[in-house]
Amino acid sequence: MRTEAQVPALQPPEPGLEGAMGHRTLVLPWVLLTLCVTAGTPEVWVQVRMEATELSSFTIRCGFLGSGSISLVTVSWGGPNGAGGTTLAVLHPERGIRQWAPARQARWETQSSISLILEGSGASSPCANTTFCCKFASFPEGSWEACGSLPPSSDPGLSAPPTPAPILRADLAGILGVSGVLLFGCVYLLHLLRRHKHRPAPRLQPSRTSPQAPRARAWAPSQASQAALHVPYATINTSCRPATLDTAHPHGGPSWWASLPTHAAHRPQGPAAWASTPIPARGSFVSVENGLYAQAGERPPHTGPGLTLFPDPRGPRAMEGPLGVR
Protein backbone atom coordinates (compact mmCIF):
# COMPACT_ATOMS: atom_id res chain seq x y z
CA MET A 1 0.00 0.00 0.00
CA ARG A 2 1.27 3.41 -0.85
CA THR A 3 0.08 6.71 0.48
CA GLU A 4 1.09 9.68 -1.56
CA ALA A 5 2.05 12.88 0.19
CA GLN A 6 -0.65 15.40 -0.48
CA VAL A 7 0.15 18.85 -1.76
CA PRO A 8 -2.44 21.22 -0.40
CA ALA A 9 -4.62 22.74 -3.06
CA LEU A 10 -4.33 26.45 -3.52
CA GLN A 11 -7.62 28.16 -2.99
CA PRO A 12 -8.04 31.57 -4.55
CA PRO A 13 -9.87 34.13 -2.44
CA GLU A 14 -13.54 34.58 -3.13
CA PRO A 15 -14.18 37.07 -5.90
CA GLY A 16 -16.49 38.90 -3.59
CA LEU A 17 -18.77 41.51 -5.18
CA GLU A 18 -16.63 42.15 -8.20
CA GLY A 19 -18.34 42.00 -11.55
CA ALA A 20 -17.84 39.38 -14.20
CA MET A 21 -14.94 41.26 -15.69
CA GLY A 22 -13.23 41.53 -12.33
CA HIS A 23 -13.78 37.86 -11.72
CA ARG A 24 -12.30 37.01 -15.06
CA THR A 25 -9.23 39.13 -14.40
CA LEU A 26 -8.69 37.23 -11.18
CA VAL A 27 -8.93 33.84 -12.84
CA LEU A 28 -5.87 34.47 -14.97
CA PRO A 29 -3.59 35.26 -12.03
CA TRP A 30 -4.61 32.04 -10.36
CA VAL A 31 -4.05 30.03 -13.48
CA LEU A 32 -0.66 31.65 -13.82
CA LEU A 33 0.09 31.11 -10.16
CA THR A 34 -0.70 27.45 -10.50
CA LEU A 35 1.57 27.28 -13.54
CA CYS A 36 4.34 29.12 -11.75
CA VAL A 37 4.11 26.70 -8.87
CA THR A 38 3.58 23.42 -10.67
CA ALA A 39 4.88 23.66 -14.19
CA GLY A 40 8.49 22.68 -14.52
CA THR A 41 8.47 21.34 -10.99
CA PRO A 42 9.33 17.70 -11.34
CA GLU A 43 9.47 15.68 -8.17
CA VAL A 44 11.22 12.50 -7.17
CA TRP A 45 9.55 10.24 -4.67
CA VAL A 46 11.35 7.56 -2.71
CA GLN A 47 9.69 4.69 -0.90
CA VAL A 48 11.60 2.30 1.36
CA ARG A 49 9.98 -0.88 2.59
CA MET A 50 11.33 -3.61 4.82
CA GLU A 51 10.02 -7.03 3.86
CA ALA A 52 8.08 -8.77 6.59
CA THR A 53 9.50 -12.14 5.64
CA GLU A 54 13.13 -11.11 5.72
CA LEU A 55 14.18 -8.36 8.07
CA SER A 56 17.42 -7.87 6.19
CA SER A 57 15.58 -7.38 2.91
CA PHE A 58 14.56 -3.96 1.66
CA THR A 59 12.66 -2.80 -1.36
CA ILE A 60 13.39 0.70 -2.57
CA ARG A 61 11.07 2.26 -5.09
CA CYS A 62 11.71 5.60 -6.74
CA GLY A 63 9.65 7.55 -9.17
CA PHE A 64 9.96 10.67 -11.23
CA LEU A 65 6.96 12.95 -11.40
CA GLY A 66 7.77 14.98 -14.42
CA SER A 67 7.07 15.01 -18.10
CA GLY A 68 10.65 14.75 -19.25
CA SER A 69 12.63 12.03 -20.92
CA ILE A 70 14.75 10.06 -18.48
CA SER A 71 18.40 9.60 -19.37
CA LEU A 72 19.81 7.85 -16.31
CA VAL A 73 18.85 6.64 -12.84
CA THR A 74 21.26 6.24 -9.96
CA VAL A 75 20.36 4.64 -6.62
CA SER A 76 22.70 5.00 -3.67
CA TRP A 77 22.69 4.46 0.05
CA GLY A 78 24.32 6.02 3.05
CA GLY A 79 23.57 9.46 1.67
CA PRO A 80 23.48 11.21 -1.67
CA ASN A 81 25.67 9.63 -4.30
CA GLY A 82 27.98 12.60 -4.49
CA ALA A 83 28.10 13.24 -0.77
CA GLY A 84 29.29 10.11 0.93
CA GLY A 85 26.79 7.70 -0.54
CA THR A 86 27.62 4.41 -2.20
CA THR A 87 26.09 3.50 -5.54
CA LEU A 88 23.80 0.49 -5.50
CA ALA A 89 22.47 0.52 -9.05
CA VAL A 90 22.56 2.53 -12.24
CA LEU A 91 19.88 2.22 -14.90
CA HIS A 92 19.97 3.51 -18.46
CA PRO A 93 16.86 3.27 -20.64
CA GLU A 94 18.72 1.55 -23.48
CA ARG A 95 22.15 0.46 -22.36
CA GLY A 96 20.85 -1.51 -19.43
CA ILE A 97 21.32 -1.89 -15.70
CA ARG A 98 24.22 -2.46 -13.41
CA GLN A 99 23.98 -3.19 -9.73
CA TRP A 100 26.29 -3.90 -6.83
CA ALA A 101 25.84 -6.07 -3.76
CA PRO A 102 23.78 -6.02 -1.67
CA ALA A 103 21.45 -5.01 -4.49
CA ARG A 104 19.77 -8.15 -5.72
CA GLN A 105 17.48 -6.90 -8.44
CA ALA A 106 17.14 -3.48 -9.99
CA ARG A 107 14.50 -2.99 -12.63
CA TRP A 108 12.27 -0.49 -14.34
CA GLU A 109 8.76 -0.71 -12.93
CA THR A 110 7.24 1.77 -15.32
CA GLN A 111 8.57 4.38 -17.67
CA SER A 112 8.99 6.70 -14.72
CA SER A 113 9.74 4.50 -11.74
CA ILE A 114 12.25 1.89 -10.72
CA SER A 115 12.55 -0.62 -7.92
CA LEU A 116 15.53 -2.16 -6.22
CA ILE A 117 15.57 -5.17 -3.94
CA LEU A 118 18.35 -5.27 -1.39
CA GLU A 119 19.29 -8.15 0.80
CA GLY A 120 22.32 -9.22 2.66
CA SER A 121 23.88 -10.04 5.96
CA GLY A 122 26.90 -8.77 7.74
CA ALA A 123 28.83 -5.78 6.52
CA SER A 124 26.82 -5.26 3.39
CA SER A 125 23.43 -5.64 4.99
CA PRO A 126 21.19 -2.59 5.10
CA CYS A 127 19.73 -1.65 8.43
CA ALA A 128 16.53 0.07 9.43
CA ASN A 129 17.86 3.60 9.52
CA THR A 130 19.80 3.46 6.28
CA THR A 131 19.14 6.35 3.94
CA PHE A 132 18.51 5.51 0.30
CA CYS A 133 18.77 8.12 -2.40
CA CYS A 134 17.54 8.27 -5.96
CA LYS A 135 18.75 10.58 -8.68
CA PHE A 136 16.91 11.07 -11.95
CA ALA A 137 18.53 12.82 -14.90
CA SER A 138 15.95 13.91 -17.41
CA PHE A 139 15.43 16.24 -20.32
CA PRO A 140 14.56 19.04 -20.06
CA GLU A 141 14.30 19.12 -16.28
CA GLY A 142 17.90 18.23 -15.52
CA SER A 143 19.00 16.26 -12.45
CA TRP A 144 16.66 15.73 -9.52
CA GLU A 145 17.32 13.83 -6.35
CA ALA A 146 15.60 12.74 -3.18
CA CYS A 147 16.37 10.44 -0.28
CA GLY A 148 14.25 8.35 2.01
CA SER A 149 14.59 5.89 4.84
CA LEU A 150 12.40 3.75 7.03
CA PRO A 151 11.04 5.61 10.05
CA PRO A 152 12.74 4.22 13.17
CA SER A 153 9.44 2.83 14.42
CA SER A 154 8.46 1.13 11.17
CA ASP A 155 7.06 -2.33 11.53
CA PRO A 156 8.37 -4.94 9.11
CA GLY A 157 6.17 -5.21 6.09
CA LEU A 158 5.11 -1.61 6.28
CA SER A 159 6.54 1.00 4.03
CA ALA A 160 7.47 4.55 4.51
CA PRO A 161 5.21 6.74 2.43
CA PRO A 162 6.81 7.97 -0.73
CA THR A 163 8.77 11.08 -0.06
CA PRO A 164 8.34 13.94 -2.46
CA ALA A 165 11.65 15.29 -3.57
CA PRO A 166 12.83 18.61 -2.31
CA ILE A 167 13.65 21.18 -4.89
CA LEU A 168 17.41 21.05 -5.25
CA ARG A 169 18.49 22.22 -8.63
CA ALA A 170 17.45 21.94 -12.21
CA ASP A 171 20.15 21.91 -14.82
CA LEU A 172 20.37 24.65 -17.36
CA ALA A 173 18.51 22.64 -19.93
CA GLY A 174 15.42 22.64 -17.74
CA ILE A 175 15.89 26.14 -16.48
CA LEU A 176 16.24 27.77 -19.86
CA GLY A 177 13.45 25.82 -21.45
CA VAL A 178 10.66 26.11 -18.95
CA SER A 179 11.72 29.00 -16.81
CA GLY A 180 11.67 31.63 -19.52
CA VAL A 181 7.99 31.06 -20.11
CA LEU A 182 7.30 30.78 -16.41
CA LEU A 183 9.27 33.88 -15.59
CA PHE A 184 7.23 35.89 -18.02
CA GLY A 185 4.03 34.43 -16.59
CA CYS A 186 5.12 35.06 -13.03
CA VAL A 187 6.11 38.65 -13.77
CA TYR A 188 2.75 39.19 -15.39
CA LEU A 189 1.11 37.54 -12.41
CA LEU A 190 2.87 39.90 -10.02
CA HIS A 191 1.80 42.79 -12.19
CA LEU A 192 -1.82 41.65 -12.00
CA LEU A 193 -1.64 41.00 -8.29
CA ARG A 194 -0.26 44.50 -7.79
CA ARG A 195 -3.29 45.92 -9.50
CA HIS A 196 -5.41 44.11 -6.94
CA LYS A 197 -3.43 45.28 -3.93
CA HIS A 198 -6.56 45.76 -1.89
CA ARG A 199 -6.98 42.00 -1.95
CA PRO A 200 -4.63 40.11 0.39
CA ALA A 201 -2.40 37.70 -1.48
CA PRO A 202 -2.94 34.08 -0.47
CA ARG A 203 -0.19 32.47 1.54
CA LEU A 204 1.32 29.36 0.08
CA GLN A 205 1.61 26.82 2.83
CA PRO A 206 4.05 23.98 2.55
CA SER A 207 3.01 20.45 3.33
CA ARG A 208 2.82 20.03 7.10
CA THR A 209 4.24 16.56 7.27
CA SER A 210 7.53 17.73 8.76
CA PRO A 211 7.20 21.38 9.69
CA GLN A 212 10.57 21.68 11.36
CA ALA A 213 12.57 20.20 8.52
CA PRO A 214 14.92 22.66 6.90
CA ARG A 215 13.74 23.95 3.58
CA ALA A 216 15.34 22.77 0.41
CA ARG A 217 17.63 25.24 -1.21
CA ALA A 218 16.35 26.49 -4.53
CA TRP A 219 19.18 26.30 -7.00
CA ALA A 220 17.35 27.87 -9.89
CA PRO A 221 15.76 31.30 -9.80
CA SER A 222 12.61 29.92 -11.34
CA GLN A 223 12.23 27.59 -8.40
CA ALA A 224 12.06 30.17 -5.70
CA SER A 225 8.32 30.00 -5.55
CA GLN A 226 8.32 26.26 -6.00
CA ALA A 227 10.55 25.61 -3.06
CA ALA A 228 7.99 27.11 -0.77
CA LEU A 229 5.60 24.32 -1.56
CA HIS A 230 7.86 21.48 -0.56
CA VAL A 231 9.34 20.74 2.81
CA PRO A 232 11.88 17.95 2.60
CA TYR A 233 11.86 15.19 5.12
CA ALA A 234 14.71 14.97 7.54
CA THR A 235 17.29 12.51 6.36
CA ILE A 236 18.35 10.06 9.01
CA ASN A 237 22.06 9.59 9.22
CA THR A 238 22.86 5.95 8.99
CA SER A 239 25.29 4.35 11.36
CA CYS A 240 25.51 1.10 9.49
CA ARG A 241 26.74 2.13 6.09
CA PRO A 242 28.94 -0.70 4.84
CA ALA A 243 32.64 -0.16 4.61
CA THR A 244 32.97 -2.66 1.81
CA LEU A 245 30.87 -3.58 -1.12
CA ASP A 246 31.10 -6.81 -3.04
CA THR A 247 31.03 -6.61 -6.77
CA ALA A 248 27.70 -7.92 -7.92
CA HIS A 249 27.94 -11.25 -9.65
CA PRO A 250 26.61 -11.19 -13.15
CA HIS A 251 23.25 -12.79 -13.53
CA GLY A 252 20.49 -12.79 -16.03
CA GLY A 253 17.88 -10.24 -15.11
CA PRO A 254 14.33 -10.10 -16.35
CA SER A 255 13.87 -9.29 -19.96
CA TRP A 256 13.69 -5.59 -20.77
CA TRP A 257 9.96 -5.53 -21.35
CA ALA A 258 9.12 -7.88 -18.52
CA SER A 259 9.20 -4.99 -16.12
CA LEU A 260 6.29 -3.26 -17.81
CA PRO A 261 3.30 -3.01 -15.49
CA THR A 262 0.49 -5.36 -16.33
CA HIS A 263 -1.84 -2.44 -16.77
CA ALA A 264 0.37 -0.80 -19.36
CA ALA A 265 -1.78 0.49 -22.16
CA HIS A 266 0.63 -0.45 -24.88
CA ARG A 267 3.93 -2.16 -25.37
CA PRO A 268 6.70 0.31 -26.12
CA GLN A 269 8.06 0.02 -29.63
CA GLY A 270 11.67 -0.05 -28.56
CA PRO A 271 14.09 1.15 -25.93
CA ALA A 272 13.43 4.75 -26.82
CA ALA A 273 9.90 4.29 -25.57
CA TRP A 274 11.36 4.43 -22.09
CA ALA A 275 12.00 8.10 -22.59
CA SER A 276 10.46 9.04 -19.28
CA THR A 277 12.10 6.39 -17.16
CA PRO A 278 13.18 7.88 -13.86
CA ILE A 279 16.53 8.46 -12.36
CA PRO A 280 17.19 8.26 -8.66
CA ALA A 281 17.90 11.47 -6.95
CA ARG A 282 20.14 12.89 -4.28
CA GLY A 283 19.68 14.01 -0.74
CA SER A 284 16.76 15.92 0.60
CA PHE A 285 18.13 19.10 2.04
CA VAL A 286 21.74 18.46 1.30
CA SER A 287 22.92 21.22 -0.97
CA VAL A 288 24.50 19.40 -3.85
CA GLU A 289 26.28 21.14 -6.68
CA ASN A 290 25.21 19.16 -9.66
CA GLY A 291 28.38 18.29 -11.47
CA LEU A 292 26.59 15.60 -13.44
CA TYR A 293 29.20 13.06 -12.45
CA ALA A 294 31.81 15.12 -14.14
CA GLN A 295 34.26 15.49 -11.29
CA ALA A 296 37.40 14.06 -12.76
CA GLY A 297 40.34 12.34 -11.29
CA GLU A 298 38.87 10.34 -8.45
CA ARG A 299 38.02 6.68 -8.59
CA PRO A 300 37.52 4.08 -5.95
CA PRO A 301 40.67 2.05 -5.37
CA HIS A 302 40.22 -1.66 -5.79
CA THR A 303 41.47 -4.11 -3.21
CA GLY A 304 40.90 -7.16 -5.29
CA PRO A 305 38.71 -8.64 -7.96
CA GLY A 306 35.79 -9.32 -5.66
CA LEU A 307 36.08 -6.78 -2.90
CA THR A 308 36.22 -3.06 -3.34
CA LEU A 309 36.66 -0.23 -0.91
CA PHE A 310 34.84 2.95 -1.79
CA PRO A 311 36.22 5.95 0.03
CA ASP A 312 35.27 7.99 -3.01
CA PRO A 313 31.88 9.49 -2.22
CA ARG A 314 30.62 8.61 -5.67
CA GLY A 315 31.01 4.95 -4.89
CA PRO A 316 31.38 2.19 -7.44
CA ARG A 317 30.48 2.61 -11.04
CA ALA A 318 29.34 -0.03 -13.39
CA MET A 319 28.02 -0.86 -16.77
CA GLU A 320 25.41 -3.03 -18.15
CA GLY A 321 25.24 -4.76 -21.40
CA PRO A 322 22.53 -3.56 -23.71
CA LEU A 323 19.06 -4.20 -22.33
CA GLY A 324 20.01 -6.33 -19.41
CA VAL A 325 21.71 -6.83 -16.11
CA ARG A 326 25.23 -7.96 -16.74
Epitope: E94, A137, G142, Y293, A294, E298
Partner: antibody, heavy 122, light 107 residues
Framework: QVQLVQSGAEVKKPGASVKVSCKAS????????IYWVRQAPGQGLEWMGH????????DYAQKLQGRVTMTTDTSTSTAYMELRSLRSDDTAVYYC???????????????WGQGTLVTVSS | DIQMTQSPSSLSASVGDRVTITCQAS??????LNWYQQKPGKAPKLLIY???SLHTGVPSRFSGSGSGTDFTFTISSLQPEDIATYYC?????????FGGGTKVEIK
Amino acid sequence: QVQLVQSGAEVKKPGASVKVSCKASGYTFTHYGIYWVRQAPGQGLEWMGHIYAYSGDTDYAQKLQGRVTMTTDTSTSTAYMELRSLRSDDTAVYYCARGSPTYEHFNWFDPWGQGTLVTVSS
Amino acid sequence: DIQMTQSPSSLSASVGDRVTITCQASDDISDYLNWYQQKPGKAPKLLIYDASSLHTGVPSRFSGSGSGTDFTFTISSLQPEDIATYYCQQYGNLPITFGGGTKVEIK
Protein backbone atom coordinates in the same frame (compact mmCIF):
# COMPACT_ATOMS: atom_id res chain seq x y z
CA GLN B 1 19.40 2.80 -37.77
CA VAL B 2 21.46 4.78 -35.30
CA GLN B 3 23.62 7.20 -37.21
CA LEU B 4 25.83 10.25 -36.72
CA VAL B 5 26.47 12.39 -39.78
CA GLN B 6 29.15 15.07 -39.64
CA SER B 7 29.69 18.21 -41.67
CA GLY B 8 32.23 18.35 -44.49
CA ALA B 9 35.96 18.97 -44.58
CA GLU B 10 37.30 22.41 -43.73
CA VAL B 11 40.50 24.27 -44.55
CA LYS B 12 41.36 27.04 -42.12
CA LYS B 13 44.14 29.50 -41.52
CA PRO B 14 46.02 29.64 -38.21
CA GLY B 15 44.15 31.74 -35.67
CA ALA B 16 40.77 31.06 -37.26
CA SER B 17 37.90 29.04 -35.81
CA VAL B 18 36.08 25.97 -37.05
CA LYS B 19 32.67 24.63 -36.11
CA VAL B 20 31.91 20.99 -36.86
CA SER B 21 28.37 19.64 -36.69
CA CYS B 22 27.20 16.14 -35.88
CA LYS B 23 23.59 15.23 -36.65
CA ALA B 24 22.17 12.25 -34.79
CA SER B 25 19.31 10.06 -35.91
CA GLY B 26 17.74 6.72 -35.03
CA TYR B 27 17.74 7.11 -31.25
CA THR B 28 16.56 9.34 -28.42
CA PHE B 29 19.16 12.10 -28.54
CA THR B 30 18.79 13.16 -24.90
CA HIS B 31 19.42 9.65 -23.56
CA TYR B 32 23.07 9.94 -24.48
CA GLY B 33 26.09 12.18 -24.59
CA ILE B 34 28.09 13.22 -27.63
CA TYR B 35 31.82 12.69 -27.29
CA TRP B 36 34.38 14.32 -29.55
CA VAL B 37 37.61 12.56 -30.48
CA ARG B 38 40.26 13.71 -32.90
CA GLN B 39 43.02 11.95 -34.77
CA ALA B 40 46.02 13.75 -36.22
CA PRO B 41 47.43 12.26 -39.45
CA GLY B 42 49.10 8.93 -38.71
CA GLN B 43 48.46 9.32 -34.99
CA GLY B 44 46.22 7.76 -32.36
CA LEU B 45 42.89 8.83 -30.93
CA GLU B 46 42.55 11.78 -28.55
CA TRP B 47 39.47 12.55 -26.46
CA MET B 48 38.59 16.24 -26.74
CA GLY B 49 35.56 16.43 -24.49
CA HIS B 50 31.89 15.63 -24.36
CA ILE B 51 28.46 17.09 -23.81
CA TYR B 52 25.47 15.48 -22.12
CA ALA B 53 22.53 16.06 -24.41
CA TYR B 54 19.93 16.07 -21.63
CA SER B 55 21.57 18.90 -19.71
CA GLY B 56 24.09 20.60 -21.92
CA ASP B 57 26.79 20.00 -19.32
CA THR B 58 30.29 19.61 -20.73
CA ASP B 59 33.74 18.31 -19.88
CA TYR B 60 36.75 19.31 -21.93
CA ALA B 61 40.28 18.00 -22.21
CA GLN B 62 42.55 20.25 -20.19
CA LYS B 63 44.81 21.08 -23.14
CA LEU B 64 41.82 22.44 -25.07
CA GLN B 65 40.19 24.40 -22.24
CA GLY B 66 39.37 27.90 -23.35
CA ARG B 67 39.60 27.05 -27.04
CA VAL B 68 36.84 24.50 -27.42
CA THR B 69 33.10 24.81 -26.99
CA MET B 70 30.62 21.97 -27.35
CA THR B 71 26.92 22.59 -27.71
CA THR B 72 23.78 20.74 -28.73
CA ASP B 73 20.52 21.63 -30.38
CA THR B 74 18.03 19.11 -29.05
CA SER B 75 15.33 20.27 -31.45
CA THR B 76 17.39 19.02 -34.38
CA SER B 77 19.38 16.33 -32.50
CA THR B 78 22.59 18.00 -33.55
CA ALA B 79 25.82 18.49 -31.64
CA TYR B 80 28.44 21.09 -32.44
CA MET B 81 32.11 21.40 -31.63
CA GLU B 82 33.82 24.75 -32.12
CA LEU B 83 37.58 25.06 -31.90
CA ARG B 84 39.10 28.54 -31.85
CA SER B 85 42.59 29.96 -32.33
CA LEU B 86 43.50 27.14 -34.64
CA ARG B 87 47.12 26.04 -34.92
CA SER B 88 48.79 23.76 -37.41
CA ASP B 89 48.84 20.92 -34.88
CA ASP B 90 45.03 21.03 -34.78
CA THR B 91 45.05 19.50 -38.25
CA ALA B 92 43.19 16.25 -37.72
CA VAL B 93 40.11 14.22 -38.46
CA TYR B 94 37.47 15.16 -35.89
CA TYR B 95 34.98 12.48 -34.89
CA CYS B 96 31.79 12.66 -32.88
CA ALA B 97 30.59 9.52 -31.16
CA ARG B 98 27.56 8.57 -29.11
CA GLY B 99 28.38 7.81 -25.50
CA SER B 100 26.69 7.76 -22.14
CA PRO B 101 24.81 10.60 -20.41
CA THR B 102 27.44 10.25 -17.70
CA TYR B 103 31.06 9.43 -18.39
CA GLU B 104 31.02 7.09 -15.40
CA HIS B 105 28.55 4.48 -16.61
CA PHE B 106 27.62 2.72 -19.84
CA ASN B 107 30.26 4.70 -21.64
CA TRP B 108 31.27 2.99 -24.81
CA PHE B 109 31.37 4.95 -28.04
CA ASP B 110 28.97 3.63 -30.63
CA PRO B 111 28.35 4.65 -33.29
CA TRP B 112 30.91 7.15 -34.56
CA GLY B 113 30.43 9.85 -37.14
CA GLN B 114 32.28 9.47 -40.42
CA GLY B 115 34.81 12.11 -39.37
CA THR B 116 35.52 15.66 -40.51
CA LEU B 117 38.96 16.55 -41.77
CA VAL B 118 40.08 19.97 -40.58
CA THR B 119 43.25 21.24 -42.17
CA VAL B 120 44.97 24.23 -40.62
CA SER B 121 47.44 25.77 -43.02
CA SER B 122 48.67 29.22 -43.89
CA ASP C 1 45.66 11.18 -16.14
CA ILE C 2 45.46 7.44 -16.62
CA GLN C 3 47.96 6.30 -19.22
CA MET C 4 47.05 3.37 -21.43
CA THR C 5 50.04 1.39 -22.65
CA GLN C 6 49.17 -0.85 -25.55
CA SER C 7 51.46 -3.54 -26.89
CA PRO C 8 52.69 -4.48 -29.33
CA SER C 9 52.45 -1.36 -31.46
CA SER C 10 52.28 -3.54 -34.54
CA LEU C 11 52.21 -7.22 -35.37
CA SER C 12 52.15 -9.46 -38.40
CA ALA C 13 50.35 -12.80 -38.32
CA SER C 14 49.01 -15.40 -40.70
CA VAL C 15 45.36 -16.03 -41.48
CA GLY C 16 43.99 -18.39 -38.85
CA ASP C 17 46.51 -17.36 -36.20
CA ARG C 18 45.55 -16.41 -32.69
CA VAL C 19 46.38 -12.77 -32.09
CA THR C 20 46.69 -11.22 -28.64
CA ILE C 21 46.99 -7.52 -27.79
CA THR C 22 47.51 -6.22 -24.27
CA CYS C 23 46.60 -2.94 -22.68
CA GLN C 24 47.90 -1.77 -19.33
CA ALA C 25 46.39 1.08 -17.34
CA SER C 26 48.55 3.23 -15.10
CA ASP C 27 45.85 3.05 -12.41
CA ASP C 28 42.98 0.76 -11.50
CA ILE C 29 40.06 1.23 -13.88
CA SER C 30 38.01 -1.81 -12.82
CA ASP C 31 36.45 -3.04 -16.07
CA TYR C 32 35.83 0.36 -17.62
CA LEU C 33 37.69 -0.46 -20.78
CA ASN C 34 36.59 -0.70 -24.41
CA TRP C 35 38.25 -1.99 -27.58
CA TYR C 36 37.83 -0.46 -31.04
CA GLN C 37 38.84 -1.44 -34.54
CA GLN C 38 39.83 1.21 -37.07
CA LYS C 39 40.42 0.49 -40.72
CA PRO C 40 42.38 2.94 -42.88
CA GLY C 41 40.36 6.03 -43.76
CA LYS C 42 37.39 4.92 -41.63
CA ALA C 43 35.98 5.80 -38.25
CA PRO C 44 36.65 3.47 -35.32
CA LYS C 45 34.12 0.72 -34.57
CA LEU C 46 33.27 -0.66 -31.16
CA LEU C 47 34.16 -4.33 -30.68
CA ILE C 48 34.30 -4.96 -26.93
CA TYR C 49 32.87 -2.86 -24.12
CA ASP C 50 33.45 -3.12 -20.38
CA ALA C 51 36.55 -5.26 -20.87
CA SER C 52 34.78 -8.43 -21.94
CA SER C 53 31.33 -7.79 -23.42
CA LEU C 54 31.04 -8.44 -27.12
CA HIS C 55 29.21 -5.65 -28.93
CA THR C 56 26.16 -6.58 -30.99
CA GLY C 57 27.02 -7.84 -34.45
CA VAL C 58 30.71 -8.37 -33.73
CA PRO C 59 32.04 -11.82 -34.71
CA SER C 60 32.69 -14.16 -31.81
CA ARG C 61 36.35 -14.58 -32.75
CA PHE C 62 36.93 -11.28 -30.97
CA SER C 63 37.10 -11.37 -27.18
CA GLY C 64 38.37 -9.35 -24.28
CA SER C 65 39.35 -10.02 -20.70
CA GLY C 66 40.95 -8.39 -17.72
CA SER C 67 40.16 -6.10 -14.83
CA GLY C 68 41.96 -3.49 -12.80
CA THR C 69 45.10 -2.57 -14.73
CA ASP C 70 45.75 -5.44 -17.13
CA PHE C 71 43.59 -6.20 -20.13
CA THR C 72 43.81 -8.52 -23.09
CA PHE C 73 42.16 -8.44 -26.50
CA THR C 74 42.18 -11.61 -28.58
CA ILE C 75 41.35 -12.54 -32.14
CA SER C 76 41.02 -16.33 -31.97
CA SER C 77 41.46 -16.90 -35.69
CA LEU C 78 42.75 -13.99 -37.74
CA GLN C 79 40.82 -13.23 -40.92
CA PRO C 80 41.90 -11.05 -43.86
CA GLU C 81 39.20 -8.50 -43.02
CA ASP C 82 40.71 -8.06 -39.55
CA ILE C 83 43.59 -6.00 -40.96
CA ALA C 84 43.21 -2.78 -38.99
CA THR C 85 44.51 -0.80 -36.03
CA TYR C 86 43.04 -1.72 -32.66
CA TYR C 87 42.69 0.71 -29.76
CA CYS C 88 41.85 0.27 -26.10
CA GLN C 89 40.09 3.10 -24.28
CA GLN C 90 39.43 3.67 -20.60
CA TYR C 91 36.68 5.68 -18.98
CA GLY C 92 37.47 4.90 -15.35
CA ASN C 93 38.50 8.51 -14.94
CA LEU C 94 38.50 11.75 -16.83
CA PRO C 95 40.19 12.47 -19.06
CA ILE C 96 39.12 9.52 -21.15
CA THR C 97 42.27 8.09 -22.69
CA PHE C 98 43.14 5.70 -25.51
CA GLY C 99 46.02 3.32 -25.96
CA GLY C 100 48.51 4.10 -28.70
CA GLY C 101 47.03 1.48 -31.01
CA THR C 102 48.16 -1.86 -32.41
CA LYS C 103 48.45 -2.23 -36.15
CA VAL C 104 47.62 -5.77 -37.26
CA GLU C 105 48.87 -6.97 -40.63
CA ILE C 106 48.71 -10.25 -42.51
CA LYS C 107 51.98 -12.08 -43.17
